[in-house]
Amino acid sequence: ESGYAQNGDLEDAELDDYSFSCYSQLEVNGSQHSLTCAFEDPDVNTTNLEFEICGALVEVKCLNFRKLQEIYFIETKKFLLIGKSNICVKVGEKSLTCKKIDLTTIVKPEAPFDLSVIYREGANDFVVTFNTSHLQKKYVKVLMHDVAYRQEKDENKWTHVNLSSTKLTLLQRKLQPAAMYEIKVRSIPDHYFKGFWSEWSPSYYFRTPEINNSSGEMD
């Protein structure tokens, strides 16, 4: 593909809606940052369409995105992370639509991992812990986490807890006895950076003890 449209194609292209959204991930691969963009309309014909970012880059004026199926992607150390860049959808040399974006305001953290729940019998509670790669990062270190849990049978009845640490205690008396629970966690930038929620961590499943009939307490 040349990346250039015939005149008729260009006229057709101008009738389409090329609105798009992007997110950045900082220090996602060592000191490399990434930027991912996609069209809002999944039915856009992306043949011959390219994305380009210009401005607020180190040592270069512009960078072209790589196309990976329906998304457009850059991984580079060349983001200045200061000021606004211009991100454009192009057909050949013609820009169809552009957005001015500060990459530090569209940050999507990496998903938390190693989520686990440990029951403490003496304390009658559950200690939830998880890990995040952001603790080791230079830039996006401060995150707000959203822990969501539900009884497995209650499909859409999630309870959410926001916290800034990676440890949470759930009191046993707040949970149903002898029930299977699903729990998951995601993160969003908090302080210094703005952006979007990460993907959810893989879910963790745990069972609450049964009630001990003689004492009225859970086992």
Partner: nanobody, 118 residues
Framework: EVQLVESGGGLVQAGGSLRLSCESS????????MGWVRQAPGKEREFLAA????????HYSDSVQGRFTISRDNAKNTVYLQMNSLKSEDTGRYYC???????????WGQGTQVTVSS
Amino acid sequence: EVQLVESGGGLVQAGGSLRLSCESSISTFSSDAMGWVRQAPGKEREFLAAIGWSGAVTHYSDSVQGRFTISRDNAKNTVYLQMNSLKSEDTGRYYCAEDYDTDVWQYWGQGTQVTVSS
């Protein structure tokens, strides 16, 4: 109507320090990148330092890295340039700039003169 006002310049001995301030009256200050640029006599403007909207990201030219520090106070709409170990070649007019948009600073102050005597 004046939107960026620099202060803190003056005459200083080589090896000395100065702290420049720049107060902005631009409504978008807290979401704008800020920077400092200098112009030595008979030379072009030279980028020195820039800082992102939150203060988390900074960038320096090789000529001032390790000697100058840029910072900001979004509550006071002010950006600072702490200049240490000054050299005679640091002499010039120091300009504050705001809103780095696609490699162009959108707003400029009138500048403040810094003279380093040896």
